[in-house]
Interface confidence: medium
């Protein structure tokens, strides 16, 4: 995502809202240009703190970050629902918090990937995230921009629920993807992507172990454990929702 070239004098303007901002995008709209840890209060939610990344594309909420293996991502449903990790380092914001930010709106999901050779890839999707009653299903609402679309995520319109080892909602009848891989994810058939997999600093020899890693199949391949990932979300204006 493009960095802010020109930091603006930060948001004393927030006071003109007379309430906490709903999300990072609203923060951006009232003049905040500094990325960091901010308190927000989505509609109908208690306040909580989020990492905002301010870019020339507006304000984005960071919902996931991996870069050093310092946090265990192989956690149960309740942990993925509530969130875990370190705001300074590796973390998962929490499905309930993400859903409170997006509400019923369509959103832009940005996925930043980095391999061990310093190569980086940015993917952007238009998505809709359901609530817990849908197992936080992720639905693609528009075609994917860029080269890496089709086989990485469900086809446009298909909804994939979130799965953990103790709550198996994946699209495989014969397998629990979260259990045979690692971490919680929107698992379709286990093989497209998993950014919450096990962190490997060196590539293990056994494929059985390797498949548990962090991967994005159409970028560096099914058995290439990525070095770093960041996921960010930005709700679209209400009228953009279908």
């Amino acid at each position: 995502l493009p960095e802010m070239a020109q930091p603006v004098d930060p948001a004393h303007n927030v006071s003109r809202l007379h309430r906490l901002p709903r999300d990072c995008q609203e923060l951006f709209q009232v003049g905040e240009r500094q990325s960091g840890l901010f308190e927000i209060q989505p509609q109908g939610s208690p306040p909580f703190l989020v990492n905002c990344k301010m870019t020339s594309d507006g304000g984005w909420t960071v919902i996931q970050r991996r870069h050093d293996g310092s946090v265990d991502f192989n956690r149960p449903w309740e942990a993925y629902k509530a969130g875990f990790g370190d705001p300074h380092g590796e973390f998962w914001l929490g499905l309930e918090k993400v859903h409170s930010i997006t509400g019923d709106r369509n959103s832009r999901l940005a996925v930043q990937l980095r391999d061990w050779d310093g190569n980086a890839e940015l993917l952007q999707f238009s998505v809709h995230l359901g609530g817990e009653d849908t197992a936080y299903s992720l639905q693609l609402t528009a075609p994917v921009a860029g080269q890496l679309g089709a086989t990485t995520v469900p086809p446009s319109g298909l909804s994939v629920p979130f799965s953990t080892w103790d709550q198996d909602h994946d699209l495989r009848r014969d397998k629990n993807c979260a259990k045979s891989l690692s971490g919680g994810w929107w698992f379709g058939t286990c093989s497209h992507s998993n950014l919450n997999g096990q962190y490997f600093r060196s590539i293990p020899q056994q494929r059985q172990k390797l498949k548990k890693g962090i991967f994005w199949k159409t970028w560096r391949g099914r058995y290439y454990p990525l070095q770093a990932t960041t996921m960010l979300i930005q709700p679209m204006a209400a009228e953009a929702a279908s």
């Epitope: 905040e32 960091g36 909580f48």
Partner: nanobody, 124 residues
Framework: EVQLVESGGGLVQAGGSLRLSCAAS????????MGWFRQAPGKEREFVTV????????YYADSVKGRFTISKDIAKNTVYLQMNSLKPDDMAVYYC?????????????????WGQGTQVTVSS
């Protein structure tokens, strides 16, 4: 002008507990958030935890999550840091800081007022 005074530091054995206090005087009702940072010898000052004054949102560094608890007593204009299961790694000077306005809560530059610090020593 706001003054912050920390207390409660000291020497404790690994596995023990301490409770730090940070009393704000002056115009503390104008605060947006109060946080704790720490600095070990030869290291940079690092974020530990923060609490927002009105919303009451809290955030912890992963290294202290589940062991440290931040709380506030608005009537006394005081923020507390309850530190349990202390480890040698927790040994540092602990600083209380106050942010006057809405902003980035783990950037030290966004905190307007700082206490003088209180030493926490953990012996193994």
């Amino acid at each position: 002008e706001v003054q912050l005074v920390e207390s409660g530091g000291g020497l404790v054995q690994a596995g023990g507990s301490l409770r730090l206090s940070c009393a704000a005087s002056g115009r503390p009702f104008s605060m947006y958030a109060m946080g704790w940072f720490r600095q070990a010898p030869g290291k940079e000052r690092e974020f530990v935890t923060v609490i927002t004054w009105s919303g009451g949102s809290t955030y912890y560094a992963d290294s202290v999550k589940g062991r440290f608890t931040i709380s506030k007593d608005i009537a006394k204009n005081t923020v507390y840091l309850q530190m349990n299961s202390l480890k040698p790694d927790d040994m540092a000077v602990y600083y209380c800081a106050a942010a006057r306005r809405y902003g980035n809560l783990y950037n030290t530059n966004n905190y307007d007022y700082w206490g003088q610090g209180t030493q926490v020593t953990v012996s193994s």
